[in-house]
């Protein structure tokens, strides 16, 4: 299918939203039970909807 | 400018077979997850599968699941539906879309953030 | 599967007023719900992902909150662009279910 496979990794099942461990550029995407290639998150200083675009800032302020 | 662009749709009778394809610009699709949804004539979205083509996982919704197979070649950028054994309920707009994923502790928190222009699957005798 | 059950199915509004759509999530799935905006004949467009976060280029009149079960949109001050149907998503687990969407029409 040309799919190339990049790096060894659990698949998890489809319930479990444990995240694996992923590399730096990466984050574990529950959805699809991998890790995937992560942008920047942004976090307003007021912890509500903003209107930054994302990657502006770099802390999250609480987990998803 | 990142772009999806579907084809491949058409007319088809039921117990027919249909490939549709998701060509991609832009951006590598092998570093996202790439999802089919679907939407009957004035009805709601429904997803249909998604694939993660650096990995090659794949997973389909019940109502497709068995007919359809969903993948992707990373040397063309382009992601595919096959559909075979088609019903007239699968008649609808299939769209393609990306899934953006943003860093939040290590935890995707996306949504699907661009659409291709959807091509018309009709399933008809 | 996880249901997204989206209320009012529609609603009558008018160019400057306040609109909230709900979501209602049949479990928990944290902050994972998205929010979309679909126009007759086009593809949809993210607005809010995360529960809460503004994408990309949206104006600030829409917002998203909740967690849990129940969710939030606002449009602050509609404007006549904004008649359209809008659709939640949560995507903590496949299948990513949708809402039944919200279809904003004009008084």
């Known amino acids: 299918m040309g799919a190339r496979r990049l790096r060894v990794r659990s698949q998890r099942s489809r319930d479990s939203s444990v995240p694996t461990q992923c590399n730096q550029t990466e984050c574990f995407d529950p959805l699809v039970r991998n890790c995937v290639s992560c942008e920047l998150f942004h976090t307003p200083d007021t912890g509500h909807t903003s209107s930054l675009e994302p990657g502006t800032a770099l802390q999250p302020q609480e987990g998803s | 400018e990142v772009q999806l662009v579907e084809s491949g749709g058409g007319l088809v009778q039921p117990g027919g077979s249909l490939r549709l394809s998701c060509a991609a610009s832009?951006?590598?699709?092998?570093?996202?997850?790439i999802h089919w949804v679907r939407q009957a004539p004035g009805k709601g979205l429904e997803w249909v599968a998604w694939?993660?083509?650096?990995?090659?996982?794949?997973d389909y919704a019940d109502s497709v699941k068995g007919r359809f197979t969903i993948s992707a070649d990373t040397s063309k950028n382009t992601a595919y539906l096959q559909m075979n054994s088609l019903r007239a309920e699968d008649t609808a707009v299939y769209y393609c879309?990306?899934?953006?994923?943003?860093?939040?502790?290590?935890?995707?928190?996306?949504?699907?953030?661009?659409w291709g222009q959807g091509t018309l699957v009709t399933v008809s005798s | 599967d996880i249901q997204m059950t989206q209320s009012p199915s529609s609603l009558s509004a008018s160019v400057g007023d306040r609109v909230t759509i709900t979501c209602r999530a049949s479990?928990?799935?944290?902050?994972?719900v998205a929010w979309y905006q679909q126009k007759p004949g086009k593809a949809p467009k993210l607005l809010i992902y995360?529960?809460?976060f503004l994408y990309s280029g949206v104006p600030s009149r829409f917002s998203g909150s909740g967690s849990g079960t129940d969710f939030t949109l606002t449009i602050s001050s509609l404007q006549p662009e904004d008649f359209a149907t809008y659709y939640c998503?949560?995507?903590?687990?496949?299948?990513?279910?949708f809402g039944q969407g919200t279809k904003v029409e004009i008084k």
């Open positions: 879309a990306r899934r953006v994923c943003y860093n939040r502790l290590g935890v995707c928190a996306g949504g699907m953030d661009y």
């Open positions: 832009g951006f590598t699709i092998s570093s996202n997850s």
């Open positions: 694939v993660t083509p650096g990995v090659g996982s794949t």
């Open positions: 479990q928990d799935v944290s902050t994972a």
């Open positions: 995360s529960a809460s």
């Open positions: 998503q949560q995507s903590l687990m496949t299948p990513p279910t």
